[in-house]
Interface confidence: medium
């Protein structure tokens, strides 16, 4: 699956006009603690992985979202699930992997060209559903939206990663968000944040660059849980 350098993780905080309803957070598989990493329909074996309970997407890593691991979205405990790749179904931006966002219920690539100058965004909206008309019709509407003509450089204030130049992402810095460099191989990254701690993370890191993922550094496996160091490593 192709992931571009740009990411829509910063969009996690926003309501989902393009991303769809935030409800129905079901998943294909149930967690098998310590062995399987559920989510995104892919089984991934992660070193010492324990399903991490969460209440919202912000408590999970940049390549995860928060949802119930039960099929069909029945209410229950929510855990951090692997993000969903391009062309997978989604209900909100946070479900899509870095470099993608949720559009019309599908994770699509937020490639650089998509955000250049004036773009046309096709969205599906409903009208008259349950109220003025009998049927709710899905209506394809073409919206012309002015985007930033000049991309934010490092340190520029931003709302989302698409506001930033190539190689940068939009991350929290104190109580605002600025464009920061996407992490390179070997750089320290943030993974599986504990409940509530994300709110304290006033210096948020970017995600790992293309072809890299945030994993426990090999020589830190024996370290205590609290001091485990995660770095960007080749897949």
């Amino acid at each position: 699956t192709l992931n571009s350098v740009l990411n829509s993780n910063a969009i996690k905080n926003l309501p989902p006009p393009l991303g769809g309803a935030a409800g129905h957070p079901g998943s294909a598989v149930s967690a098998a603690p310590g062995i399987l990493y559920p989510g995104g329909n892919k089984y991934q074996t992660i070193d010492n992985y324990q399903p991490y309970p969460c209440a919202e997407d912000e408590e999970c890593g940049t390549d995860e979202y928060c949802a119930s691991p039960t099929r069909g979205g029945d209410a229950g405990v929510q855990i951090c699930l692997a993000c969903r790749k391009r062309r997978k179904r989604c209900m909100r931006h946070a479900m899509c992997c870095p470099g993608n966002y949720c559009k019309n219920g599908i994770c699509v690539s937020s490639d650089q060209n998509h955000f250049r100058g004036e773009i046309e965004e096709t969205i599906t909206e409903s009208f008259g559903n349950d109220h003025s008309t009998l049927d709710g019709y899905s209506r394809r509407t073409t919206l012309s939206s002015k985007m930033y003509h000049t991309k934010g450089q490092e340190g520029s204030v931003c709302l989302r990663s698409s506001d930033c130049a190539s190689g940068l992402c939009c991350a929290r810095h104190f109580w605002s968000k600025i464009c920061k460099p996407v992490l390179k191989e070997g750089q320290v990254c943030t993974k599986h944040r504990r409940k509530g701690s994300h709110g304290l993370e006033i210096f948020q890191r970017c995600y790992c660059g293309e072809g890299l993922s945030c994993r426990i550094q090999k020589d830190h496996h024996q370290a205590s849980n609290s001091s485990r160091l995660h770095t960007c490593q080749r897949h």
């Epitope: 294909a28 329909n41 892919k42 979205g73 179904r89 219920g105 599908i106 599906t124 909206e125 899905s138």
Partner: antibody
Framework: QVQLVQSGAEVKKPGASVKVSCKAS????????ISWVRQATGLGLEWMGW????????GYAQNFQGRVTMTWNTSISTVYMELSSLRSEDTAVYYC????????????WGRGTTVTVSS | DIQMTQSPSSLSASVGDRVTITCQAS??????LNWYQQKPGKAPKLLIY???NLETGVPSRFSGSGSGTDFTFTISSLQPEDIATYYC?????????FGQGTRLEIK
């Protein structure tokens, strides 16, 4: 119990349109996608597309793009599939199926609606 | 589109036999595969999801395995009520595609 009830068989002329309904009961209608799958006599299954009644998002297979429209009425838990510009090769049984949007598993199916296109 | 090829297209087996159907994807689909059973004149029924997970209420004689491009569906001990056509379905990429089906009959 959990079920999808589809409208009755239809006979149409080439070039006409057909609208098939699918009424859901026994589950939270807005918590799932509804997919439409068709099956011509003696042939396999062909996925036409899906819609999510909660968000109204739809996704159609390329083969049907421009000819198929999926709509819904949440108040009566019903989705509709309209296929236009019918041709003889559209003669098939059309199924609606409850679909989990994480793994696209179609775990509850309607009984199917037979659509015959003949001049 | 991802092509799904099932083999054999039909097979005949005796009650109690172990039956195996294979499904091959035209590209790597990880474990994004479901299996369905369709009896004559009826709608399909989901048996296996995510390549190897048994759907609720489905007898344990049905199982699935595989990942990547090669998948296997097995009935450990064939029962008379298992006479049907079986389909694999991929959901790794849109559009969703099905195999052409395998017709299973009793000898």
């Amino acid at each position: 119990q959990v079920q999808l009830v589809q409208s009755g068989a239809e006979v149409k002329k080439p070039g006409a349109s057909v609208k098939v309904s699918c009424k859901a009961s026994g589950f939270t209608f807005t918590s799932y996608d509804i997919s439409w799958v068709r099956q011509a006599t003696g042939l396999g299954l062909e996925w036409m597309g899906w819609m999510n009644p909660s968000s109204g998002y739809t996704g159609y297979a390329q083969n049907f793009q421009g000819r198929v429209t999926m709509t819904w009425n949440t108040s009566i838990s019903t989705v509709y599939m309209e296929l236009s510009s019918l041709r003889s090769e559209d003669t098939a049984v059309y199924y609606c199926a409850r679909t989990d949007y994480y793994y696209y598993g179609m775990d509850v199916w309607g009984r199917g609606t037979t659509v015959t296109v003949s001049s | 589109d991802i092509q799904m090829t099932q083999s054999p297209s039909s097979l005949s087996a005796s009650v109690g036999d172990r039956v195996t159907i294979t499904c091959q994807a035209s590209q790597d689909i990880s474990k994004d595969l479901n299996w369905y059973q369709q009896k004559p004149g009826k709608a399909p029924k989901l048996l296996i999801y995510d390549a190897s997970n048994l759907e609720t209420g489905v007898p344990s004689r049905f199982s699935g395995s595989g990942s990547g491009t090669d998948f296997t569906f097995t009935i450990s001990s064939l029962q008379p009520e298992d006479i049907a056509t079986y389909y694999c379905q991929q959901y790794d990429d849109l559009p969703i595609t099905f195999g052409q089906g395998t017709r299973l009959e009793i000898k």
